[in-house]
């Protein structure tokens, strides 16, 4: 008789999840010499231990502490790029500008990027059928708690000038409910961070508006000000040209506004 299984509103665990995490870990540690000491089997065991046999609505940051410890990584604190609702461009940027890092350029971010996972209370099974949706089911699910934990730590580590890429095509350019708006912005440390510089990425080719004057950007400036951190904002009118100029900064067309 098949066991009754909780039906959640979100998609189930990504297929071949254990193999994917292990393979990504091996690949990452091969490419990044500073992480060669990491034992990927231990990393997977710690990852698995955070959610297996636990109710997928009762996950805590403490559950992920063993994984956080194994994945401890030092990135240059003044080279951090945060992003909100514009992941692809942010990743394209750090692929070119190799000395800057998004969360997904770190080991833990790389392991979990675009994956879903959850377990079941009191069984060692991974649930491939469904996992809790943040809105419809519960916020303390394995995926949300993971990203909240790593995002908080990433923001806490930042220093000097921190950059954030924001999507100017969205109705809320800065969204208080995004991971950036609800976690990262509140965990930048004023003793270390001098300025948050927002890059607002324009979508339309004919869009010449100053999106730095958008009301939601004023909300972001407000939160940052309350944290005793300076705020600045730049419009990126032509993201294609922006990336091109990062690749070839000496190009003559790269002196004008992007």
């Amino acid at each position: 008789v098949p066991r009754w299984r909780q039906q959640w509103s979100g998609p189930g665990t990504t297929k071949r999840f254990p193999e994917t995490v292990l393979a990504r870990c091996v690949k990452y540690t091969e490419i990044h010499p500073e992480m060669r000491h990491v034992d990927c089997q231990s990393v997977w065991d710690a990852f698995k231990g955070a959610f297996i046999s636990k109710h997928p609505c009762n996950i805590t940051e403490e559950d992920y502490q063993p994984l956080m410890k194994l994945g401890t990584q030092t990135v240059p604190c003044n080279k951090i790029l945060l992003w909100s609702r514009i992941k692809d461009l942010a990743h394209q940027f750090t692929q070119v500008q190799r000395d800057m890092f998004t969360l997904e350029d770190t080991l833990l971010g790389y392991l979990a990027d675009d994956l879903t996972w959850c377990g079941e209370f009191n069984t060692s099974k991974i649930n491939y059928q469904s996992c809790p949706d943040w809105r419809k089911d519960c916020s303390n699910n394995p995926v949300s708690v993971f990203w909240k934990t790593v995002s908080r730590r990433f923001a806490e580590a930042a220093c000097d000038v921190v950059h954030v890429m924001l999507n100017g095509s969205r109705s809320k350019i800065f969204d208080k409910n995004s991971t950036f708006g609800s976690v990262e912005v509140h965990n930048l440390q004023p003793e270390k961070v001098q300025t948050l510089e927002a890059w607002v990425i324009h979508g339309g080719r004919e869009d010449s508006r100053d999106l730095c004057q958008d009301p939601t950007i004023k909300e972001l400036e407000s939160i940052i000000s309350k944290r005793n951190i300076q705020f600045s904002c730049k419009n990126i009118y032509r993201p294609d040209k922006f990336l091109q100029c990062v690749k070839n900064p000496e190009d003559s067309s790269c002196t004008s506004e992007i």
């Epitope: 208080k176 609800s182 509140h186 003793e191 407000s222 939160i223 000000s225 005793n228 951190i229 300076q230």
Partner: antibody, heavy 123, light 107 residues
């Protein structure tokens, strides 16, 4: 305990300059931003802007750009408001107030205020 | 700039009565509204901060509610020490703006 102590009342003539001080104690001065608020007689409170106590960088509300200047003396845990070329309409009480943020709960509040400094501009 | 409209401008209440003050904002400010009490000759005192949070040491008879653009500040059982001006301040976006105040007197 946390205190913001402001300098005493000022009587000035139009065209003169005034510099008000706000000395903080009871907390780490450079951890929290300092706001300045104007209250003219019988009028609303008006937020003038804030001062980054780490960098000394000021941010002014549109109405207070030009003749107004915020500055800092970190070693003395003191913030300053200077008003140049005083006008009659600058007659008001000026308050300093810090922005507090809770590190554990994302809470923010303009919680502690100075006692206010009365500036009277009259010929 | 967010405009904050506060009413009533003045209020005369008997001791023991319930006091209600309202602020409307011209833009959606989530729950980033703060409420201050200012007695004559004193600086404003923060009673309630963002998220309708009662500040430490403030009596529980003070409370607030609201989200978006409509906010209400109430306190039960008015006392003589409550005679003061009351202000709402939005801290959602720069520049921070303040309501016109409510002067509370004893009837």
């Amino acid at each position: 305990q946390i205190q913001l102590v402001q300098s005493g009342p000022e009587l000035k003539k139009p065209g003169e300059t005034v510099k008000i001080s706000c000395k903080a104690s009871g907390y780490t001065f450079t951890n929290y931003g300092m706001n300045w608020v104007k209250q003219a007689p019988g009028e609303d409170l008006k937020w003038m802007g804030w001062l980054n106590t780490n960098t000394g960088e000021p941010t002014y509300a549109e109405e207070f750009k030009g003749r107004f200047a915020f500055s800092l003396e970190t070693s003395a845990s003191t913030a300053y408001l200077q008003i140049n070329n005083l006008r009659n309409e600058d007659t008001a009480t000026y308050f300093c107030a810090r922005w507090y943020y809770g590190s554990s709960d994302n809470s923010y509040a303009m919680d502690y205020w100075g006692q206010g400094t009365s500036v009277t501009v009259s010929s | 700039e967010t405009i904050v409209t506060q009413f009533p401008a003045s209020l005369s209440m008997a001791i023991g009565e319930k006091v209600t003050i309202r602020c409307i904002t011209s833009t959606d400010i989530d729950d980033d509204m703060n409420w201050y009490q200012q007695r004559p000759g004193e600086p404003p005192k923060l009673l309630i901060s963002e998220g309708n949070t009662l500040r430490p040491g403030v009596p529980s008879r003070f409370s607030s509610s609201g989200y978006g653009t409509d906010f209400v500040f109430t306190f039960e059982n008015m006392l003589s020490e409550d005679v003061a001006d009351y202000y709402c301040l939005q801290s959602d976006s720069l520049p921070y703006t303040v309501g016109g105040g409510t002067r509370l007197e004893i009837k």
